[in-house]
């Protein structure tokens, strides 16, 4: 089951997820001046069995002003960014991408891939959030949020990450902690 | 489904102490900040800070630290604001809310009138 | 802490009135703006959150726009079950704060 709505934006925070459920779906988007080939997938989609997961399907860019046929996939690392984040400033990996079941692992990117990648996430998907440069996290409470379905329909848990700037955290004594880890995670509201 | 309960109302003399509560049900209570909102009488709404039930982490607005205290006893999600020596001016409704951004479920609210 | 300032105070109108109430930030909130309506005796509702994303069961006639420091709240047909009085409340900039609330009453 597909997610309605995108994972939630919050203050001063970026999301990303560290792998993808099966089902999950990457649009095949160019860069300005390119298209897909005319053959080509619309998405790649994350596909597998019992003991492996993976992409199927490849995207493909070309020249919008040439009728030339496919471009080889070679990695471009600048060019690879997930929809609605920018990159994280640290390695935020509370899990290892490959040790997880059902999942696949960030996709390659393709050669003249779009800047921005297009998700259609499924029901159990996690994303993490960390705080963007010149904030930090006011607590280490769950910093993600997980696309669940209640009453037929699906909604995101709602992050429990603030953000502050080194000014505003000035204001409120305390001990700062560190960034959140996944242990407690806001759960769903009972089911109906 | 959510729900936030409060306490009921209480009258109180100058001076005295009081801690009032707010029980949730129907989500992960230790996982979410609680805020509390004060509401002066015919006045709006005044964010007062929040607490994380999982381990009591708090946090106070300016206006009112070191006036009221803020615990948590996530064993039975509850949510606790007290106060050590009441005031004439502390007599308000007082709200506890689901948090942390903005508060999409809230208790019904408990009236705290401090009166000699 | 980030002040917020609704006008007007008060707002006299009338059933099937388009009803618009501002809320102005001291500095840019980006996009982090809440709308709560509260009624007499009652705890105040969330109506809008991130600006303009009207929260779920909420009825379509309300709608909130604006970005930065300017924002509104706007109802599009006024209804007898919408006088109450409106609050906004930024969340970009720790603590949270809350405007002073616009009452809507009958004309």
């Known amino acids: 089951e597909l997610c309605d709505d995108d994972p939630p934006e919050i203050p001063h925070a970026t999301f990303k997820a560290m792998a993808y459920k099966e089902g999950t779906m990457l649009n095949c988007e160019c860069k300005r001046g390119f298209r897909r080939i005319k053959s080509g997938s619309l998405y790649m989609l994350c596909t597998g069995n019992s003991s492996h997961s993976s992409w199927d399907n490849q995207c493909q860019c070309t020249s919008s002003a040439t009728r030339n046929t496919t471009k080889q996939v070679t990695p471009q690392p600048e060019e690879q960014k997930e929809r609605k984040t920018t990159e994280m400033q640290s390695p935020m990996q509370p899990v290892d991408q490959a040790s997880l079941p059902g999942h696949c692992r960030e996709p390659p990117p393709w050669e003249n891939e779009a800047t921005e990648r297009i998700y259609h996430f499924v029901v159990g998907q996690m994303v993490y959030y960390q705080c963007v440069q010149g904030y930090r996290a006011l607590h280490r409470g769950p910093a993600e949020s997980v696309c669940k379905m209640t009453h037929g329909k699906t909604r995101w848990t709602q992050p429990q990450l603030i953000c502050t700037g080194e000014m505003e955290t000035s204001q409120f004594p305390g001990e700062e902690k560190p960034q959140a880890s996944p242990e407690g995670r806001p759960e769903s509201e009972t089911s109906c | 489904q959510v729900q936030l309960v409060q306490s009921g109302a209480e009258v109180k003399k100058p001076g005295e102490s009081l801690k009032i509560s707010c029980k949730g049900s129907g989500y992960s209570f230790a996982n979410y900040w609680i805020v509390w909102v004060r509401q002066m009488p015919g006045k709006g709404l005044e964010w007062m800070g929040i607490?994380?039930?999982?381990?009591?982490?708090?946090r106070y607005s300016p206006s009112f630290q070191g006036q009221v205290t803020f615990s948590a006893d996530k064993s039975i999600s509850t949510a606790y604001l007290q106060w050590s020596s009441l005031k004439a001016s502390d007599t308000a409704m007082y709200y506890c809310?689901?948090?942390?951004?903005?508060?999409?479920?809230w208790g019904q609210g408990t009236l705290v009138t401090v009166s000699s | 802490d980030i002040q917020m300032t609704q006008s007007p105070s008060t707002l006299s109108a009338s059933v099937g009135d388009r009803v618009t109430i501002t809320c102005r930030a001291s500095?840019?909130?980006?996009?982090?703006l809440a709308w709560y309506q509260q009624k007499p005796g009652k705890a105040p509702k969330l109506l809008i959150y991130?600006?303009?994303s009207l929260e779920s069961g909420v009825p379509s006639r309300f709608s909130g726009s604006g970005s930065g420091t300017e924002f509104t709240l706007t109802i599009s047909s006024l209804q007898p079950d919408d006088f109450a009085t409106y609050y906004c409340?930024?969340?970009?900039?720790?603590?949270?704060?809350f405007g002073q609330g616009t009452k809507v009453e009958i004309k």
């Open positions: 991130k600006a303009s």
């Open positions: 500095q840019s909130v980006s996009s982090w």
């Open positions: 607490i994380y039930p999982d381990d009591s982490e708090t």
């Open positions: 809310t689901r948090g942390p951004y903005y508060s999409d479920y």
């Open positions: 409340q930024q969340y970009s900039s720790y603590s949270w704060t």
